[in-house]
Interface confidence: low
């Protein structure tokens, strides 16, 4: 069956060393247990983090990524899932997409991640 | 089946504080976004303020900024709204609502708590 | 802020009648719209989501459709204990997250 995949639709913004969180789903919400899941940087096309199979496939992730990344898939008998990226660093700024497949079927949704430095200030003077 | 109870409503004169409460269960909660979202007597619905699962984002209507603040704790799974500078325009019925997994819907709503703003 | 508006604002109906419900929206929302019932004394339900989709155990006679900034809620043969409030919901430009006024659908 056909779905479409909506991601957050607003620019999700963390600061440096905190967490970030990439909520993604698909429309209608169904079971995506045995899908493919996924996200990768655009435009780069480097793998941020891959389920398939019901297992997340570290060895797929981009070594940049790699240990700093969870999948939060407690509802994702209903089609919603999050990407979770810890100690959030500059390089990890800019466009995302994330990816539903079933089979031959995919789609797939774009998100920014915008990343604040916490100790940023003006200077008055 | 999913359950959210609200409590800590009641009477206050402006300028009063209130902190209110909800207990989840039913549901992993650290895997949901929580919202309030009140009603005015006999009016419609507003959105007051929300959190992420990791308490890192929290947004505030424009009407409550600077007066209230959002906060929960995983452990307890609980959500709370501290209400301050209370004013008569605040007096709802306070639901605690939970996110239809990040999309920003409502799925589930306690049955709210009364809070009156009155001299 | 995005306003949403509900028309009418009062529907009289009869039980096994059709339910014709609008929401408009100020500026367009594609379709990021919400639809919630509420009945006297209790909280709202929702119904519908991303204006087309039945939530979960929502009766097949609720049916939502439109995009941009103009939606619509059917009840398709109205039940009496679908007489109630409705809201509309955004959840485009956020936040905040508004709703419309509510239409209140009633027993003719």
């Known amino acids: 069956g056909q779905f479409r995949v909506i991601g957050p639709g607003y620019p999700i913004r963390a600061l440096v060393g905190d967490e970030a969180e990439l909520p993604c789903r698909i429309s209608p919400g169904k079971n995506a247990t045995g899908m493919e899941v996924g996200w990768y940087r655009s435009p780069f096309s480097r793998v941020v983090h891959l389920y398939r199979n019901g297992k997340d496939q570290d060895a797929e992730q981009a070594p940049e990524y790699r240990g700093r990344t969870e999948l939060l898939k407690e509802t994702i008998s209903e089609g919603k899932v999050t990407l979770r990226i810890q100690n959030v660093r500059f390089s990890d700024e800019g466009g995302y997409t994330c990816f539903f497949r079933d089979h031959s079927y995919q789609e797939e949704a774009a998100m920014e991640l915008k990343v604040e430095d916490p100790f940023y200030w003006v200077n008055p003077g | 089946q999913v359950q959210l109870v609200e409590s800590g409503g009641g009477l206050v004169k402006p300028g009063g504080s209130l902190r209110l409460s909800c207990a989840a269960s039913g549901f992993t909660f650290s895997s949901y976004s929580m919202h309030w979202v009140r009603q005015a007597p006999g009016k419609g619905l507003e959105w007051v303020s929300d959190?992420?699962?990791?308490?890192?984002?929290?947004n505030y209507a424009d009407s409550v900024k600077g007066r209230f603040t959002i906060s929960r704790d995983n452990a307890k799974n609980s959500v709370y709204l501290q209400m301050h500078s209370l004013r008569d325009e605040d007096t709802a019925v306070y639901y605690c609502?939970?996110?239809?997994?990040?999309?920003?819907?409502?799925?589930?709503w306690g049955q709210g708590t009364l809070v009156t703003v009155s001299s | 802020e995005i306003v949403m508006t509900q028309s009418p604002a009062t529907l009289s109906l009869s039980p096994g009648e059709r339910a014709t419900l609008s929401c408009r929206a100020s500026q367009s929302v594609s379709s990021y719209l919400a639809w919630y019932q509420q009945k006297p004394g209790q909280a709202p339900r929702l119904l519908i989501y991303?204006?087309?989709n039945r939530a979960t155990g929502i009766p097949a006679r609720f049916s939502g459709s439109g995009s941009g900034t103009d939606f619509t809620l059917t009840i398709s043969s109205l039940e009496p204990e679908d007489f109630a409030v409705y809201y509309c919901q955004q959840r485009s430009n956020w936040p905040p997250y508004t709703f419309g006024q509510g239409t209140k659908l009633e027993i003719k």
């Open positions: 991303d204006a087309s």
């Open positions: 959190i992420s699962t990791n308490s890192r984002t929290r």
């Open positions: 609502a939970r996110d239809y997994g990040g999309i920003y819907y409502f799925d589930y």
